[in-house]
Interface confidence: low
């Protein structure tokens, strides 16, 4: 067990041309915070994959306000170290992701907004107990300077924090087979305590609590012999005639993998594939808990109150990802009403409204008809961002000032002739058709597809459209 420690020295513009503008302004003050994610080995994993060695979040830095247009200086940083405790051995090789986040403190709807300013990643070799290693990483126009180290927590020592030291019980030399625990003069290396019940003949361990099997033996405690010949029934009873060694229960029987891990057999033991948020030989260790604040952008962390349970981030609208670290296109939700144009400014959503509408989401319909008049008995109707007149029969145009030609649209079907009338239009239908617009055919036997013609009108008579 031990702690990985990260000290951020500076975050600011990198050398060379194209210095970035300050991420903060008088209008939009902000402050920085950092997140570190550690993974064992020299992996090239995606940023979203679990931080199997652990993760940590810094405190928020001091509030910073930059004058508009001024080049960005080194930004004020949070105090203190970022510490990532690790329970198992320090792997020696590790991958890191360090994210610089900006918390914007301007006047937003719904409180502060977070955005990722820069993300740097790297792969390093590092022995526990070594000095602070200094590093410079660049992300675009930004430069991050930091130091890091891994140190063991007593009683663990060594470059992997796997050796245990205990105070000497007497001022004499250390016990048989045990070395002095350099550099702690007054301590001795403690005997390695394997997993309880681990076979002393067929098992061994390289880390405390482990039980690794010698060849020919298997099972969680290395008490089960491995078959030396092929049996018809691999899990069947022993057969003296076939000379078959019974392997007994398989290493995955009973599923030794905790927290929903899936077990697969290996030539000498078993291997657990752990779900997100867990690692360790049996998926028994959680690298991140809700106490580490793994959910960004206002995400709600559920579960993970202790290191043996996973966490889930419930993301607020506009964010997704296992840690709510990815911003979704909030404009795809079409928040602007009445045809407004959506602008995602990062720190806030803005709607540019069409004429006649207002409000944060263009939800307010302005009074288009105020001071407007519609001529010739027309009535003003609000809507569509501009005033509109519903004109009386015989009139048209924006203000109902134009006399309408009701026949202009050729309303009479099937060759009917249109006649303008003071109250509208009249269609004189061609032989075989009837109806206000001559839309109905007359049946050959003289019956029509409509109920009987109104009294006083014979089929074929012109019908007025009232």
């Amino acid at each position: 067990a031990g702690v990985f420690e990260l000290q951020i020295h500076s975050f600011g513009p990198g050398p060379g041309p194209g210095a970035p503008r300050s991420p903060c302004s008088a209008r939009l003050p902000c402050r920085l915070f950092f997140r570190v994610c550690l993974k064992p080995g020299l992996s090239e994993e995606a940023a979203e994959s679990p931080c199997a060695l652990g993760a940590a979040l810094s405190a928020r830095g001091p509030v910073y306000t930059e004058q508009p247009g001024a080049p960005a200086p080194d930004l004020p940083l949070p105090d203190g170290l970022l510490q990532v405790p690790f329970r198992d051995a320090w792997p020696g090789t590790f991958s890191f992701i360090i994210e610089t986040w900006r918390e914007e403190l301007g006047d937003q709807i719904g409180g502060p907004a977070w955005s990722l300013l820069a993300r740097v990643a790297g792969r390093r070799r590092l022995a526990a107990g070594g000095p602070w290693a200094r590093d410079i990483q660049r992300a675009g126009a930004w430069e991050l300077r930091f130091s890091y180290r891994a140190r063991c927590e007593p009683p663990a020592v060594g470059t992997a924090c796997t050796r245990l030291c205990r105070p000497r019980s007497a001022p004499s030399r250390c016990g048989p087979g045990l070395r002095p625990c350099a550099p702690l003069e007054d301590e001795c290396e403690a005997p390695l305590v394997c997993r309880a019940g681990c076979s002393p003949e067929h098992g061994f361990c390289e880390q405390p609590g482990e039980c690794r099997c010698l060849e020919g033996w298997t099972g969680p405690l290395c008490t089960v012999p491995v078959s030396t010949s092929s049996c018809l029934s691999p899990r069947g009873p022993s057969s003296a005639t076939t000379g078959c060694l019974v392997p007994g229960p398989g290493p995955c029987d009973g599923n030794p993998c905790a927290n929903g891990g899936s077990c697969s057999e290996t030539p000498r033991s078993f291997e657990c594939t752990c779900p997100r948020g867990f690692y360790g030989l049996r998926c028994e260790v959680s690298g991140v808990t809700c106490a580490d604040g793994p959910c960004f952008n206002g995400g709600l962390c559920v579960g993970g109150a202790d290191p043996d349970s996973a966490y889930i981030c419930h993301c607020p609208p506009g964010f997704q990802g296992s840690n709510c670290e990815k911003r979704v296109d909030r404009c795809s939700l079409q928040p602007c009403r009445n045809g407004g144009l959506c602008l995602d400014l990062g720190h806030a959503l803005r709607c540019r409204c069409r004429a006649g509408f207002a409000g944060p989401r263009c939800e307010h319909d302005l009074d288009d008809c105020a001071g407007r008049a519609c001529a010739n008995g027309g009535t003003c109707v609000e809507g569509g961002g501009a005033h509109r007149c519903s004109c009386a029969l015989g009139f048209g145009g924006r203000d109902c000032r134009e006399r309408a030609d009701p026949c202009a649209a050729r309303p009479c079907a099937h060759g009917g002739r249109c006649y303008a009338h003071f109250s509208g239009l009249v269609c004189a239908c061609a032989p075989g058709y009837m109806g206000a617009r001559c839309e109905f055919p007359v049946h050959p036997d003289g019956a029509s597809a409509l109920p009987a013609a109104p009294p006083g009108l014979r089929p074929g008579d012109p019908q007025r459209y009232l």
């Epitope: 420690e5 940083l77 180290r149 470059t159 350099a182």
Partner: antibody, heavy 119, light 106 residues
């Protein structure tokens, strides 16, 4: 009370190897940087390099090709070797303890050893 | 990283307020210490992390920082304070000292 006691040859000829040792008495040997710093007569201080108990070290690039710092944790000692010395290496050499991550904290120093390089 | 210390020497009287500055060639955050050295002796730590007073050092010594400028102030100079003072940055390798300021009796 932590004490640093240093010793080594004080007079060398050009091209010889400077060798100094610093013993740490009292306090822990792990958890600190152990540094060598020198000061030519009448001049300022120059950092040479540092080591920790595990043997990891860092050196001043201006001297890196000639310098080696080693550690003997069983004796709580660390040593400096500087090869191919010239008159420019004439200086008082100090050993010092630096704390991890605390910001410029060389809190304990040896008494200093004057090393003169002369033909 | 170059540490430019000024003045290189100054003359003052007992009871005077004295200020010595070190300017870093680039940002070094608070990773700077101040040391006092008397002739024939090893340097002695006064201030670490730009403004933290080392245990056992009189409170008349103080340190401050403004961006890349660092100041050591002696509020009321005492006879035992006449010495040479050095700043040291440990923000980046190699660690570098300022050129020193010799405080002499006027």
């Amino acid at each position: 009370q932590v004490q640093l006691q240093q010793w080594g040859a004080g007079l060398l000829k050009p091209s010889e190897t400077l060798s100094l040792t610093c013993a740490v008495y009292g306090g822990s040997f792990s958890g600190y940087y152990w540094s060598w710093i020198r000061q030519p007569p009448g001049k300022g201080l120059e950092w040479i390099g540092e080591i920790i108990h595990s043997g990891s070290s860092n050196y001043n690039p201006s001297l890196k090709s000639r310098v080696s710092i080693s550690v003997d944790t069983s004796k709580n000692q660390f040593s400096l070797k500087l090869s191919s010395v010239t008159a420019a290496d004439t200086a008082v050499y100090y050993c010092s303890r630096g704390e991890y991550g605390s910001g410029s904290r060389f809190d304990y120093w040896g008494q200093g050893t004057l090393v003169t390089v002369s033909s | 990283i170059q540490m430019t210390q000024s003045p290189s020497s100054l003359s003052a009287s007992v009871g005077d307020r004295v200020a010595i500055t070190c300017r870093a060639s680039q940002g070094i955050r608070d990773d700077l210490g101040w040391y006092q050295q008397k002739p024939g002796k090893a340097p002695k730590l006064l201030i670490y992390a730009a403004s933290s007073l080392q245990s056992g050092v009189p409170s008349r010594f103080s340190g401050s920082r403004s961006d890349t400028d660092f100041t050591l102030t002696i509020s009321s100079l005492q006879p035992e304070d006449f010495a040479t003072y050095y700043c040291l940055q440990d923000y980046d390798y190699p660690l570098t000292f300022g050129g020193g300021t010799k405080v002499e009796i006027k």
